[in-house]
Every structure is written in C-alpha cells, then in structure tokens.
C-alpha cells in the first residue's frame, strides 16, 4: 500500500505536462493576495529640522490580488531534467478588502532625495543634487498616493536632473506587465527529491550580491518542496523579493481544512547578526550602519536595487536589533502577525497555505551638502512599508486534495 | 604627485571660441571633480562651473550658463573648458584646479580677446 | 546665490605684526570656507580649507576661525614673504563664490 502510494506520489508531482502538480505550477489554484500597511509619517517637520524620532502610523491594508496570471514560456528541457519559466507580475486593488483608496495619501520619506544622496557621496555632486533639489521644491518626505507609493510616479527633482536618469520612482515599478525569472527548475523526472529545486535564475546558479555561500541560489521558490518533508528537514528556499535564499524550520502540526500540514516558519537566527549566527557573516555587507556587523534584523539589498538603499526587515522591525527601531515611534512588532510561514502537505511538499511577511526600508543619511538633510544627526533606517502576502488552498481544491491524497492514506 | 598641466596661451577674435584643457596626473582622475575659475586682469577669483569626471555631473555658474561647457575625458584624464562668444571682457587667466576646495591649481592658461 | 563680503580689501604691516582679514557671508555656510593666498604670476595657492583645516606644509602662523557666516583669517607673526592677495571662497553651496579679495602689504 504504502509503496504505491509512494509511486502515485512520485508519479503526480513530477512538473511536466498531465500531473496534478503541474496544472497547479502552471498557474496556481489559489488565490493570493498582497496586502500593504503604508508607514504615514506624523512629525515631518520635527525629523527633518531636529533629527527627532520619526513618529509612524500604520495605514491598512490596501490589498491586491496577486500570482493569478500563469507562468510563460514554459519550456521542458529533457536533456537535463529541468523546466524553466518567467512568473509574470501582476496585481488588481481590491477595494473590499482595503481600508481605503489607491488615491489616498500618505506622507513618506522622500525615495529619490534618500536613494539620490546616497548614491551619489562625492560632495560636488551632492551640491549639484540640492540645487536641483529646491528647484523642485523637494524635501526629506514627500506626500504621495498609495499608487505612485507603490507602483510609481515622475519625480520632480529627478525631472531636473540634466543627463538620463529614470525619472519614474516608486517601491515596486516597474511591476505590471513585467517578469521575474528566468527561473529554471527540476522537474524531478529522474529525481523526485530535487523537483522545483532552482537550477539556475536569470541564466546563473548565482545571485552576484554576496559573498560566499550567502550568494547560492537555494532551493525552491517556496510554492512546492520535494516529497516526504520531514519534520526535521530545513527547507531551504529562494525569494527575488529579499534577493535571497532563506530557509525555515519546523514549528507545529496544523490540521488545515481538514488536511493535516507542518507548519514551517522563518526563524529569528535566519535574522541574526553574524555574532550570534556565523553563517550570516556574508550577509553584513558594510561596517558603519551595521555597526561592524553587529545589528541585526535589517538586510542590505542595494547591490540588487541599482544601489538604492533599499533594506529589507520583517515588518516593525521584528527580531532585528533595538538600535535599529530606536529612532522610529509607533512600531509593535509580535511574532503572529509579523513573522513568515509556510504550511506544507508533507507527502505531496505542496504549499497550501503560507503568509510572507516582509517590510521595505530605505536609509537616509545626513548630508552637508543636502539642505533637507543637512540637519540630521544620525541615520535612520525608515519603514516605507510592509506586506503581508497571503494564500490557502480553496475549500474545493481542499476536498480533492483531502480525497485524493491525505485520504487515500489514512 | 599631483599635477595640473593646462593648455598655452591663446588669443581669439570677439565671437569666436576658446577650448582650454588640463591634464591631471598623480592621481585617479575621476576620483575628484575638476573646477575652473578665471581671473581678469588685476581682478578677483570668479567660479565658472565644475564636472564631475565619475558621474558627469556638472555645475556652471549662471553668468556662463549657456556658454560655457565643460567636458572630462576619463581615458587621458584630461578636463576641458569651451567658452563660446567671446568678446573683450573674457580676457582673463583661466585655471582648472581640484576639488571642492581647490587643493591643487593647473598654472593657469591666458585667453586674450581681441580684434 | 552666497555672497561673501570680504574685508579690509588692502591691508599694511610690519614682518612681527598680526593681521585678520575678515570674511561674512550672506547664508550660513557652517564651516565651508577656505582661505588661499596668491602671489603675483602665479596661481593661487590653498592655506586652511572647510573645517578651519590647515593644510599640510602651511606654517602654523596661519590660522582661521569662524561658523555660520562670519569667519576670520588670521596671520600671527607676519613675515616678509606673507606679502600676497588673500581670498576666501564659501564650499557650502553652489555657485561656488569668493571673496573680493584682501591686498596685504609688508613695510
């Protein structure tokens, strides 16, 4: 019984053409939605001419949905097993579930003045950039729509810029009508263990962000895993959101819709300093804002943002350090709402349920060049925002599955 | 160590155009900005504009804006400074020199308009 | 636009004297001021730069003090070959903009 369970198994989460698990690859069956809570900063003013604080408020949620549209160009390679794919990137608002509009207003770090002054750290240039800075009439925070927040706008102080420079700033842009990919994955045709392991993305086995080991694309995309995951397994994983490979460990049974699944989540040490997790060592890339490597909980990622200082953290700063969160009023981070799991069917690895949980940051630093900087004393790291993207199997899907698979086994 | 080696001496008809240049050595060009100042004589320092070698990025003084442009050649680490419609008052010494604060001087190219 | 008014424009000593040249700004610059000597054919030459720095090499009777928008160069103990044009340039903000300059004199 168990052995032909086992085959029917193997046999159905092979991702090629006629397999359950490939029609559920190929475009998911489940609805996933992406919900922001906008960081609106309160005391504007204060920030920019006292260095005081930055006083948050969280706004939300807007959701959108997400993930629905299927994967292109897929396309089989037979000779080494793998199939390769873009996932296209798309998202709807969803008024009914959003605490608002996509024209409603917040009061944001401004992203071109923060990612402008730290690109450019020769000081000429940066006399340059405040001229044209108050020719626009520009500041530390800027007042925008959740659209322009998130999927963009034409900024006025890069309108000036005198040479090309893009123009349009906002956290996710480009994002409709774009790709992420190419990915290339196993298709466990010869090897069941290795199916929906990333071979290689955009074309490399490496990321060319890190140093070292933290460099290595791991795993899956975190959708599926290789069959028969045992509690004690760490599942390795790859996120482009996070320009990363991450991994997480086993926390508790859950029973979901009746189909009983281990409950992964993302461990505080995947957060950690370099102090407490050595491993982490190549993921501290620079010495003066980590403080030499010492702070913990925030990721650098600008080497895969064109150098825009973009750091990414669990949302409220969850398990990162508390020099980190000092400068910043009004975050509660806790562990249920803000952390990252994944509920995994451990005999099919399927992801049935998941939450990703992730908060997008930016560094300013002061600047005596730059007028609206000029007055600070200290960096800061500053919440833009946070995400909480989420999906669970269908009630119908559940049913089928619960037929099909965890049925036939018990 | 560093030097700033401009271009000789030059005299030009009114309306025409002077291209002076400056060659760096002793140190990475694109590394600091490239300033020129020009002295009429007897006169004070005036600022005319700067170029960042790096990133392009380039400052003129508004009194030259529109005649004036400046160039960098990163490959013979060489700033160049044109002023276009030229006329008498343009007579001047004419120095590229290093960085914001000016650490290092070319010795200065004499442009002289005259009919 | 910066300007910066420069003042005595002509000054006179004797080699022992101290001599200020004054310097005030229409903006707060902090300390982005420099101070540069020049000597007749030749190009002008960096004593203290932004900070009140002394460059490397200037003789230690130079000095400069000053923030925001009035600023002092001080010569203590003038000698002989001191006998030069003196300016100040503001570094804080663009366009960059000088002094008119300061005529020092040794009897």
């Known amino acids: 019984g168990d052995l032909l369970i086992q085959k029917t198994i193997k046999k159905q989460v092979v991702l090629e053409e006629g397999t359950i698990a490939f029609k559920n690859w190929v475009k998911t069956g489940t609805e996933v939605y992406r919900q922001f809570w906008i960081f609106d900063v309160q005391n504007p003013q204060e920030v920019m001419m006292n260095s005081s604080n930055i006083q948050v408020k969280q706004r939300g949620p807007y959701t959108y949905r997400v993930r629905f549209l299927a994967k292109e160009n897929v396309t089989q390679d037979a000779e080494d097993n793998t199939v390769s794919f873009l996932q296209p990137n798309g998202a709807i608002f969803e008024p009914s579930l959003s605490v608002g509009t996509e024209a409603d207003n917040f009061t944001v770090l401004n992203l071109a003045v923060a990612a402008a002054s730290h690109i450019y750290q020769n000081q000429f240039v940066q006399m340059i950039l405040n001229s044209l800075i108050n020719k626009s009439k520009s500041s530390m925070f800027q007042v925008r729509t959740l659209r322009e927040l998130l999927w963009g706008y034409r900024d006025p102080f890069l309108s000036l810029v005198p040479y090309p420079v893009t123009t349009t700033v906002g956290l996710f842009y480009p994002y409709n009508n774009t790709a992420d990919g190419v990915y290339k994955v196993f298709n466990g045709k010869d090897n069941i263990s290795k199916v929906a392991i990333i071979d290689t993305y955009k074309g490399k086995r490496n990321l060319s962000y890190w140093e070292s080991h933290c460099d290595m694309i791991n795993g899956t995309d975190a959708a599926s895993f290789p069959p028969f995951v045992e509690k004690s397994q760490v599942l390795q994983f790859f996120s482009s959101d996070i320009c990363r490979s991450i991994y997480a460990v086993f926390e508790s049974d859950v029973n979901l819709k009746g189909i009983p699944v281990y409950r992964f989540v993302l461990p505080s040490k995947a957060f950690a300093s370099p102090v407490e997790n050595p491993d982490n060592y190549c993921f501290c890339t620079e010495k003066i804002i980590s403080k030499n490597c010492t702070s913990y909980g925030v990721l650098d990622i600008s080497k895969c943002k064109e150098g825009r200082p973009v750091y990414i953290s669990l949302p409220h700063f969850l398990y990162a350090s508390p020099d980190v969160s000092e400068p910043i009023d009004g975050l509660n981070p806790n562990e249920e709402e803000h952390r990252t799991y994944l509920d995994i069917e451990p005999i099919t690895g399927f992801t049935l349920q998941f939450a990703k949980r992730l908060q997008v940051n930016l560094l300013v630093k002061p600047s005596e060049k730059i007028q609206v900087l000029k007055n600070l004393k200290r960096n800061y790291i500053v919440p833009i925002l946070w995400l909480n993207e989420t999906g669970t199997i269908g009630d119908e899907k559940a049913n089928m599955f619960r037929s099909q698979v965890t049925g036939k086994i018990n | 160590q560093v030097q700033l080696v401009q271009s000789g001496a030059e005299v030009k008809k009114p309306g025409s155009s002077v291209k002076v240049s400056c060659k760096a050595s002793?140190?990475?060009?694109?590394?600091?900005?490239m300033q020129w100042v020009r002295q009429a004589p007897g006169q004070g320092l005036e600022w005319m504009g700067g170029?960042?070698?790096?990133?392009?990025?380039?400052a003129y003084a508004q009194k030259f804006q529109g005649r004036v442009t400046l160039t960098a050649d990163k490959s013979t680490s060489t700033a160049y400074m044109e002023l276009s419609s030229l006329r008498s008052e343009d007579t001047a010494v004419y120095y590229c020199t290093r960085k914001l604060d000016f650490d290092y001087w070319g010795q200065g190219t004499l442009v002289t308009v005259s009919s | 636009e910066t300007t910066v008014t420069q003042s005595p424009a002509f000054m006179s000593a004797t080699p022992g004297d101290k001599v200020t040249i004054s310097c005030i700004t229409s903006?707060?610059?902090?300390?982005?001021m420099n101070w540069y000597q020049q000597k007749p054919g030749e190009p002008p030459k960096l004593l203290i730069s932004?900070?009140?720095t002394l460059r490397p090499g200037v003789p230690s009777r130079f000095s400069s003090s000053g923030y925001g928008t009035d600023f002092t160069f001080t010569i203590n103990n003038i000698e002989s070959e001191d006998a030069a044009y003196y300016y100040c340039?503001?570094?804080?903000?663009?366009?960059?903009?000088f002094g008119q300059g300061t005529k020092l004199e040794i009897k």
């Open positions: 932004e900070g009140n």
């Open positions: 340039l503001q570094s804080d903000n663009l366009p960059l903009t």
């Open positions: 903006t707060d610059i902090d300390d982005d």
């Open positions: 170029i960042d070698p790096e990133t392009g990025g380039i």
């Open positions: 002793g140190y990475r060009f694109s590394d600091y900005e």
